[in-house]
Interface confidence: low
């Protein structure tokens, strides 16, 4: 028996359902009584879901997995993972045994989009050219870690005096805070781009300083 899986990682959004595709080619006359199907975590060998002795043995992994029982006889051994969490990320092995056996691994990459960045300024009044200001760009509840880029009004990257920190909450999602320290010109726009490297999602925030008032 030959097992086939997707070579590309499966990307799943947090709290959605993901399908880890796995298939095999059944011989003529194949019956489910012959099938032993095991899904396990590749690294730790922890059992996730199994089908043995002609029946679905159910989920061994937080009761959030399911097979496609009507499609098994056609060679579809895919696994449905419900309400995906950050901690589900990793490699899963699909192990199929009929008379002989084969296995293959598929990777699950979890992702969550970042919120539109909020911008804060310190100090936020009585600003004059030549003043040093601190601009903070904050974006929330994303995964995985964001990449943060700063640019001025002409699109020129600002790389000096940038400090970025990331904090994971109990669900493993990240809040990102990036701080730019800059000397004010006569006026100017400062933009922050928060990029999710998996989703290729960009979230933009900007602040324009033109004397008073400030524009966010």
């Amino acid at each position: 028996v030959e097992v086939q899986v997707s070579e590309d990682p499966v990307v799943a959004l947090v709290d959605t359902d993901a399908t880890l595709r796995c298939s095999f080619s059944p011989e003529p006359g194949f019956s489910l009584a012959q099938l032993n199907l095991i899904w396990q975590l590749t690294d730790t060998k922890q059992l996730v879901h199994s089908f043995t002795e002609g029946r679905d043995q159910g989920s061994a992994y937080s009761n959030r997995t399911a097979l496609f029982p009507d499609l098994l006889v056609q060679g579809n051994a895919s696994l449905r993972l419900q309400r995906v969490r950050v901690t589900d990320e990793g490699s899963y092995t699909c192990f199929v045994s009929i008379q002989d056996f084969d296995s293959a691994a598929v990777s699950l990459q979890v992702a969550a989009p970042y919120s539109k960045p909020s911008m804060t300024l310190e100090p936020n009044k009585d600003l004059r050219p030549g003043n040093m200001v601190t601009i903070t760009c904050s974006s929330y509840q994303g995964y995985p870690e964001a990449e943060v880029f700063w640019k001025d009004g002409q699109g020129v990257p600002l790389t000096g005096n940038v400090t970025t920190s990331q904090m994971a909450n109990e669900r493993g999602l990240f809040d990102v805070h990036s701080v730019l320290r800059v000397v004010l010109g006569a006026n100017g726009t400062y933009s922050c781009l928060v990029r999710n490297p998996v989703l290729q999602q960009d979230a933009h925030g900007s602040v324009t300083i033109t004397g008073q008032p400030l524009t966010f």
């Epitope: 990793g90 990459q109 995985p144 964001a146 493993g172 490297p197």
Partner: antibody, heavy 122, light 108 residues
Framework: EVQLLESGGGLVQPGGSLRLSCAAS????????MSWVRQAPGKGLEWVSG?????????YYADSVKGRFTVSRDNSKNTLYLQMNSLRAEDTAVYYC??????????????WGQGTTVTVSS | EIVLTQSPGTLSLSPGERATLTCRAS??????LAWYQQKPGQAPRLLIY???TRAAGIPARFRGSGSGTDFTLTISSLQSEDFAVYYC??????????FGGGTKVEIK
């Protein structure tokens, strides 16, 4: 075989500079976050710096090295670098590079190099 | 920055005995905690991640537990190759990633 190999350590005077390299093999280097961790003689582990996956990605530093050390990577050469300037006696340590166990993320390091020794002394 | 405090500093035990190492975080790190083993002259080796998941190839005698601020690494029956220094590391809030000060497990 997944492997990391550091080089570039040596003896340098206070105020001097050194550039460490970490050559990666056996895995898709560009997919993984990388870190530098050091260990002073007889002391524990101290995270020094880390860099995310893309060329223009985020670099992070411990307060003790911020403004003096610069981490970078060349994905085409499968190599991680640590440029160390304005070195001090307290930077004397074995420097390890480490690969995160999961792409796109700082978590825990499942692959480590053998370390390269940096000695700062006059 | 999150500070990790490991205790005891040194644990003197005989082969076959049970070792219990603790790691306490200055604030909650959820289960974003790893344990490493380091032998003299060698690089650290990842034992446990996610507070309780054994890394690939790590024997079942190593067990991690805990969440929030209090964590334990238990070695159920010490083998000669287990005598080493053990470090915990958090990865909930960074930078910086932080390590505990280490616990040395030595032969009694």
């Amino acid at each position: 075989e997944v492997q990391l190999l550091e080089s570039g350590g040596g003896l340098v005077q206070p105020g001097g500079s050194l550039r460490l390299s970490c050559a990666a093999s056996g895995f898709t280097f560009s997919d993984y976050y990388m870190s530098w961790v050091r260990q002073a003689p007889g002391k524990g582990l101290e995270w020094v710096s880390g860099i995310s996956i893309s060329y223009g990605g985020n670099a992070y530093y411990a307060d003790s090295v911020k403004g003096r050390f610069t981490v970078s990577r060349d994905n085409s050469k499968n190599t991680l670098y640590l440029q160390m300037n304005s070195l001090r006696a307290e930077d004397t340590a074995v420097y390890y590079c480490g690969r995160d166990r999961s792409p796109y993320q700082y978590r825990s390091m499942d692959v480590w190099g053998q370390g390269t020794t940096v000695t700062v002394s006059s | 920055e999150i500070v990790l405090t490991q205790s005891p500093g040194t644990l003197s035990l005989s082969p076959g005995e049970r070792a219990t190492l603790t790691c306490r975080a200055s604030q909650s790190v959820g289960d974003f905690l790893a344990w490493y083993q380091q032998k003299p002259g060698q690089a650290p080796r990842l034992l446990i991640y996610g507070a309780s998941t054994r890394a690939a190839g790590i024997p079942a005698r190593f067990r991690g537990s805990g969440s929030g601020t209090d964590f334990t690494l238990t070695i159920s029956s010490l083998q000669s190759e287990d005598f080493a220094v053990y470090y915990c590391q958090q990865y909930k809030n960074w930078p910086p990633l932080t390590f505990g000060g280490g616990t040395k497990v030595e032969i009694k």
